[in-house]
Interface confidence: low
Amino acid sequence: LQDPCSNCPAGTFCDNNRNQICSPCPPNSFSSAGGQRTCDICRQCKGVFRTRKECSSTSNAECDCTPGFHCLGAGCSMCEQDCKQGQELTKKGCKDCCFGTFNDQKRGICRPWTNCSLDGKSVLVNGTKERDVVCGPSPADLSPGASSVTPPAPAREPGHSPQ
């Protein structure tokens, strides 16, 4: 015996209150697959969330965050406050990175500067709250008589053009 609900397309629900006919999803609800026995309530992008894609009868709304906030979690389930570069978000708000750490983004935590000496290299450019140190050639390479080495270009984030 075929389940009569299996004939209900996306955008409808199998309405047991009405002898299992396929009723259209009411306003502000959707069903993204066929054979659903209920429509899901559309996500509402309220407060710090803003609507990236409107809800339709067959797909949920999608949210992102208002300026000054960024998405966290699957499907932007949370919005977290942005901080400036050189800061991290704590329970008490945005705080400057401690000495020896940096954050080059508006989100995330401050991370320790690279320890150049672990790779046998020297510090070419000192770190700041916003930028990691730049490691240069090993101290041995800088001894008198060594051939000259072209300093590497400063590191930059992928996808960003040079300043």
């Epitope: 629900f13 199998c14 309405d15 047991n16 209150n17 009411p26 609800s29 026995r37 209920t38 429509c39």
Partner: antibody
Framework: QVQLVQSGAEVKKPGSSVKLSCKAS????????INWVRQAPGQGLEWIGN????????NYNQKFKDRATLTVDKSTSTAYMELSSLRSEDTAVYYC??????????????WGQGTLVTVSS | DIQMTQSPSSLSASLGERVTITCKAS??????LSWFQQKPGKAPKTLIY???RLVDGVPSRFSGSGSGQDFTLTISSLQPEDIATYYC?????????FGGGTKVEIK
């Protein structure tokens, strides 16, 4: 806040009819099913039927199909249940309760205070 | 109509004790089962729907499990305010039908 307020207690003779009311407030009346459930003294719960105020679509428990009539007055956000040919075993507390649009996610989330109907000669 | 058999019909338990009530459907009802609590002279109150989904505001000591034909309501640690009669309700098919109830008392 959401409220379902039912009419007062009734004493009826066998063979007569009774019409109970359930006035809704605090929500969009037409968007929720109104269900009627009864409970005989010291007994369990029994579903009588439901009605969708938006289009007055009704479902009845077969046991009550011939005797119960569910109606609504959208202008006053009131649901009614009329039960005819009363007999002594209809003595019970009658509750109205709402469920939302999607039957399969139903929750009887708000209930009226109940109306006691006593059928006695 | 689908028959709902609830057991036990009554039970006595100590405060803090774990309490389990079962409900058996006469046929497969998927997960379309609710649990209600009713105190004397009051309307029932829905605790759980879809077999295991807790209604907002219901204490987390209440939990539901099961699917198909066999379902369980558990109170993890019985409190004085839990003294009541509990009913299950199937709504897989019209008409919805209730179990006979389980009266929970303090030992």
């Amino acid at each position: 806040q959401v409220q379902l307020v039912q009419s007062g207690a009734e004493v009826k003779k066998p063979g007569s009819s009774v019409k109970l009311s359930c006035k809704a407030s605090g929500y969009t009346f037409s968007s929720y099913w109104i269900n009627w459930v009864r409970q005989a003294p010291g007994q369990g719960l029994e579903w009588i039927g439901n009605i969708y105020p938006s289009d007055s679509y009704t479902n009845y428990n077969q046991k009550f199909k011939d005797r119960a009539t569910l109606t609504v007055d959208k202008s006053t956000s009131t649901a009614y249940m009329e039960l005819s040919s009363l007999r002594s075993e209809d003595t019970a507390v009658y509750y109205c309760t709402r469920t939302w649009e999607f039957y399969y996610d139903s929750v009887f989330d708000y209930w009226g205070q109940g109306t006691l109907v006593t059928v006695s000669s | 109509d689908i028959q709902m058999t609830q057991s036990p019909s009554s039970l006595s338990a100590s405060l803090g004790e774990r309490v389990t009530i079962t409900c058996k459907a006469s046929q497969d009802i998927n997960s379309y089962l609710s649990w209600f609590q009713q105190k004397p002279g009051k309307a029932p109150k829905t605790l759980i729907y879809r077999a295991n989904r807790l209604v907002d505001g219901v204490p987390s000591r209440f939990s539901g499990s099961g699917s198909g034909q066999d379902f369980t309501l558990t109170i993890s640690s019985l409190q004085p305010e839990d003294i009541a009669t509990y009913y299950c309700l199937q709504y897989d098919e019209l008409p919805p039908t209730f179990g006979g109830g389980t009266k929970v008392e303090i030992k």
